[in-house]
């Protein structure tokens, strides 16, 4: 299908050198396309804003732990 | 790229145990939600168990509380699924993946699949 070919890439060239906390985090998305040059997690704000993130840094595997959890329901 | 390879698996008899093994290799392991789901003959594949990426949570579907125990080993890129008191009801394909994607449960967040390791329960 050309569109999915043709779909663009969001890549992350840098990361926050801040740790940002739980509570102003809304959602993540990974980045895991080989076009891109680092592996990253993009983080989403509470107020929209996208901030490109190490998943190597304890803190960014806690805080999609945190994100993780919020989603959780009842299994069966 | 991040590759999965499942081991442990086998015929046991119902009430024996069985301990699987998944060793990842290709990428950062603590970064990744780990979880192992199953099919069986002729059924959709289903969750069976979640561990976060510390380790420090982790939950189980109903049908296997109680009698199965998830665990990671970050050190070594390793996510276990101890199985006792096993029931011919478990046969399946055990399979391991690693989340990438925002979720918990639920199959289309996990991003990478190992090819799956059998496990009989003969009654």
């Known amino acids: 299908q050309p569109d999915a070919i043709n779909a663009p890439v969001t890549c992350c060239y840098n990361f926050t050198n801040r740790k940002i906390s739980v509570q102003r985090l809304a959602s993540y998305r990974r980045i895991t396309s080989s076009k891109c040059p680092k592996e990253a997690v993009i983080f989403k704000t509470i107020v929209a804003k996208e901030i490109c993130a190490d998943p190597k840094q304890k803190w960014v595997q806690d805080s999609m732990d945190h994100l993780d959890k919020q989603t959780q329901t009842p299994k069966t | 790229e991040v590759q999965l390879v499942e081991s442990g698996g086998g015929l046991v008899q119902a009430g024996g145990s069985l301990r699987l093994s998944c060793a990842a290799s290709?990428?950062?392991?603590?970064?990744?939600?780990m979880g192992w789901f199953r099919q069986a003959p002729e059924k959709e594949r289903e969750f069976v168990a979640v561990?976060?990426?510390?380790?420090?949570?982790?939950s189980y579907s109903n049908s296997v509380k109680g009698r199965f125990t998830i665990s990671r080993d970050n050190a070594k890129n390793t996510v276990y699924l101890q199985m006792n008191s096993l029931k011919p009801e478990d046969t399946a394909v055990y399979y391991c993946a690693a989340g990438a994607q925002m979720g918990w449960a639920e199959a289309s967040t996990y991003d990478y699949w190992g090819q799956g390791t059998q496990v009989t329960v003969s009654s």
């Open positions: 290709g990428g950062t392991f603590s970064s990744y939600r």
């Open positions: 561990i976060t990426r510390s380790g420090g949570s982790h």
